[in-house]
């Protein structure tokens, strides 16, 4: 018969390393007689025999953790007691080893330039993972502004435009590496004007381009203000490159103005705005420029449709609120006056009035009306319409022809340019060219009137040379 023997632990517990979800086993080999009772504790708390997470075999000498969790980390002790002598105990640690895991990954961040940005990256793992960051394709270097915190988060002080980009954090230990998803750091930059428009002093009718360049993130929009109101005319060209917007406002200058470039961008619910202004002043506001202000365009009306050269440009005088309508009304009123004139005079007078009210136009930098050639005017006045002209002049002097539009809009022939001085400076009347053989058969004008320098009327040519401005009144 065996002699009683107090328990002796022959294989003391050792530190066990185990990966999460793997099996971990502690061996507590005991020699004793009679057979001992063996109990197990974790961090001094008894492990119950019926706890399904554990398996206790070999009379209690073998403790197996069936699927290790990170919370199983701790000190495991086995205690053997058989009533002979005292109980014996051996302890060992379970170190739960864990591949790196990112528990709080970074998220997309929008931040205004100059503020502080923090991209989180909280990790788990055993051994404790080291955390580094990648920007784009390369490892991010820490500096006085950029630091990886103890927690793994990335802190960027005084965020700059160049900090914008794609970031990911990397958690690494001896068991492996974990990568976060790529996140975007967007640096929003308040709108700022890089190049302000320059002031100009130009001649009337010049084209001026005002240029305004702004930067921001998001790219700003640029709007233009003229004397406090949105610019209503002029063409705007915009070009965007690398967060910089370049806006060019082309203007046809007919009046001085204060032009303001406004660059705006949005940050969440708030807007940032930058402004810069320039003045456009007009040098040499000459009388003729003031009086001849207008534009060239095709005639769309009805009254002079059959008289004016098809497709030619005519001058519209912007001293009228609606030049097209005002001039059409003038000519309509004038034609009503012509109903009573002779069949010989009427077509010539219509040609004269239409070409006087809708003068051929040279659409240069300053749109310029081309007055009727003096010789053609005199031909109508002293040949085709001699009687009517005399009668009309008499009535006019007595105030009989006065109407809401002053006088019947006939030109003063003597003030018109002569085709002999500069054939390109005035307009011929095609009707008279067509009738030139009739003109030469007219009886002589009485000596009291100036003799007409009847032109050897040349073939009509449309010339668009710039001529001196000519007032239509």
């Amino acid at each position: 018969e065996k002699l009683p023997k107090a328990p002796v632990i022959t294989t003391p517990l050792e530190t066990v390393d185990a990966l999460v979800e793997e099996v971990a086993t502690f061996m507590c080999a005991v020699e004793s007689y009679p057979q001992p009772e063996i109990s197990w504790t974790r961090n001094k708390i008894l492990i119950k025999l019926f706890d399904t997470r554990y398996s206790i075999r070999e009379n209690g000498q073998l403790l197996t953790i069936l699927s290790v969790e990170d919370s199983d980390d701790g000190i495991y002790c086995c205690t053997a007691n058989n009533g002979v002598g005292g109980a014996v105990e051996s302890c060992g640690a379970l170190q739960v080893k864990m591949k790196p895991k990112i528990t709080r990954p970074p998220i997309n961040v929008k931040i205004i330039e100059g503020l502080k940005a923090v991209l989180p990256c909280t990790t788990m793992g055993n051994p404790k993972p080291s955390v580094s960051w990648i920007k784009g394709d390369s490892a991010l270097r820490e500096n006085s502004r950029i630091a990886v915190l103890e927690s793994g988060s990335l802190r960027i002080h005084n965020v700059q435009k160049e900090d914008a980009g794609q970031y990911r954090c990397v958690a690494k230990n001896s068991l492996g590496t974990a990568y976060s998803k790529l996140v975007k750091l967007e640096v929003e930059v308040f709108a700022r004007i890089l190049r302000a428009p320059e002031s100009h002093n130009v001649t009337f009718g010049s084209f001026v381009t005002l240029r305004c360049t702004a930067i921001g993130m998001p790219v700003p929009t640029i709007s233009w203000i003229e004397n406090g109101n949105a610019v209503s005319s002029g063409s705007i060209q915009e070009n965007v490159k690398d967060r910089v917007i370049d806006s060019r406002l082309q203007l046809f200058i007919t009046k001085p103005g204060l032009y303001t470039c406004i660059a705006t961008n949005k940050h969440g619910e708030k807007f940032s705005t930058a402004k810069a202004a320039a003045t456009v002043s007009i040098a040499e506001w000459s009388k003729s420029q003031k009086e001849s202000k207008g534009y060239c365009a095709q005639y769309r009306g009805e009254v002079c449709d059959a008289v004016l050269v098809k497709d030619s440009l005519v001058f519209f005088n912007t001293s009228y609120p609606d030049p097209e309508e005002a001039q059409e009304l003038l000519i309509h009123t004038a034609w009503n006056e012509l109903k009573a004139v002779s069949p010989l005079c009427r077509p010539a007078a219509e040609a004269l009035l239409c070409n006087h009210l809708f003068q051929e136009c040279s659409p240069g930098v300053l749109p310029t009306p081309m007055p009727i050639c003096r010789e053609y005017c005199l031909a109508v006045k002293e040949l085709f319409c001699a009687k009517e002209w005399l009668a009309m002049e008499g009535k006019t002097h007595r105030g009989l022809y006065r109407s809401g539009m002053h006088f019947l809009p006939v030109p003063e022939c003597s003030k018109l340019p002569s085709m002999h001085q500069d054939p390109t400076a005035c307009t011929r009347l095609p009707y008279l060219d067509y009738k030139k053989e009739n003109i030469t058969t007219f009886p002589s004008i009485t000596s009291s009137k100036p003799s007409v320098d009847i032109p050897n009327l040349p073939a009509s040519t449309s010339s668009f040379a710039v001529s001196p401005a000519y007032s239509m009144t």
Partner: antibody, heavy 121, light 112 residues
Framework: ELQLVESGGGLVQPGGSLRLSCAAS????????MSWVRQAPGKGLEWVSA????????YYKESVKGRFTISRDNAKKTLYLQMNSLKSEDTAVYYC??????????????WGQGTLVTVSS | QAVVTQEPSLSVSPGGTVTLTCGLS?????????PDWYQQTPGQAPRGLIY???SRHSGVPSRFSGSISGNKAALTITGAQSEDEADYYC????????????FGGGTKLTVL
């Protein structure tokens, strides 16, 4: 209040005729040019015809010349479009529109709500 | 017969700027075409916006402006608003033997 009210639209067989009217109110009718513009279902705008303030001239889109006639009665403040020899491609909403001035051509600054003309057999 | 061309569709963000253009299949748009611009929302009659290149009809907000840029007429909306979502048509006066007025095919503008 300025108003343009079209009437006379409806279903007509190819080759048939219709006369559209546009009653104007709220402005001096005989001071303004007028136009007819149409819009086929799901399509864009198409200018059809124009007339100046005094009815002295008339203008038409090439494809309706000889078939359509625009006219106006300034005393009745009414614009008309007589449409003959109608074709299926004339199916559209026809709008009466007012010019901003006397002459026939130019911007249209007021429009009626339109009348539907359907040409179908 | 020249065809008047417009972008079939364009989009703009609220508060953004968008430019719609109006060209001719042959030749350039000039002031002699007197470009006009119209807005049409679904189920409504058109409404005049701009006439003779750059003049605004009364009651039209100042964010709408017209111009001729290069060889095309242009309608610029500065600071677009949701109610600007509509079809936009340009109209050109044409003279080729006879007087004519031609609309473009229209641009569907979406305000995103």
């Amino acid at each position: 209040e300025l108003q343009l009210v079209e009437s006379g639209g409806g279903l007509v067989q190819p080759g048939g005729s219709l006369r559209l009217s546009c009653a104007a109110s709220g402005f001096t009718f005989d001071d303004y040019g007028m136009s007819w513009v149409r819009q086929a279902p799901g399509k864009g705008l198409e200018w059809v015809s124009a007339i100046p303030w005094n009815g002295g001239s008339t203008y038409y889109k090439e494809s309706v010349k000889g078939r359509f006639t625009i006219s106006r009665d300034n005393a009745k403040k009414t614009l008309y479009l007589q449409m003959n020899s109608l074709k299926s491609e004339d199916t559209a909403v026809y709008y009466c529109a007012k010019r901003s001035g006397r002459i026939a051509f130019g911007a249209l600054d007021a429009w009626g709500q339109g009348t539907l003309v359907t040409v179908s057999s | 017969q020249a065809v008047v061309t417009q972008e079939p569709s364009l989009s703009v963000s609220p508060g953004g700027t968008v430019t719609l253009t109006c060209g001719l299949s042959s030749g350039s748009v000039t002031s002699s075409n007197y470009p006009d611009w119209y807005q049409q929302t679904p189920g409504q009659a058109p409404r005049g916006l701009i006439y003779s290149t750059d003049s605004r009809h009364s009651g039209v907000p100042s964010r709408f402006s017209g111009s001729i840029s290069g060889n095309k007429a242009a309608l610029t909306i500065t600071g677009a608003q949701s109610e600007d979502e509509a079809d936009y048509y340009c109209g050109l006066y044409m003279y080729s033997g006879s007087k004519n007025y031609v609309f473009g095919g229209g641009t569907k503008l979406t305000v995103l």
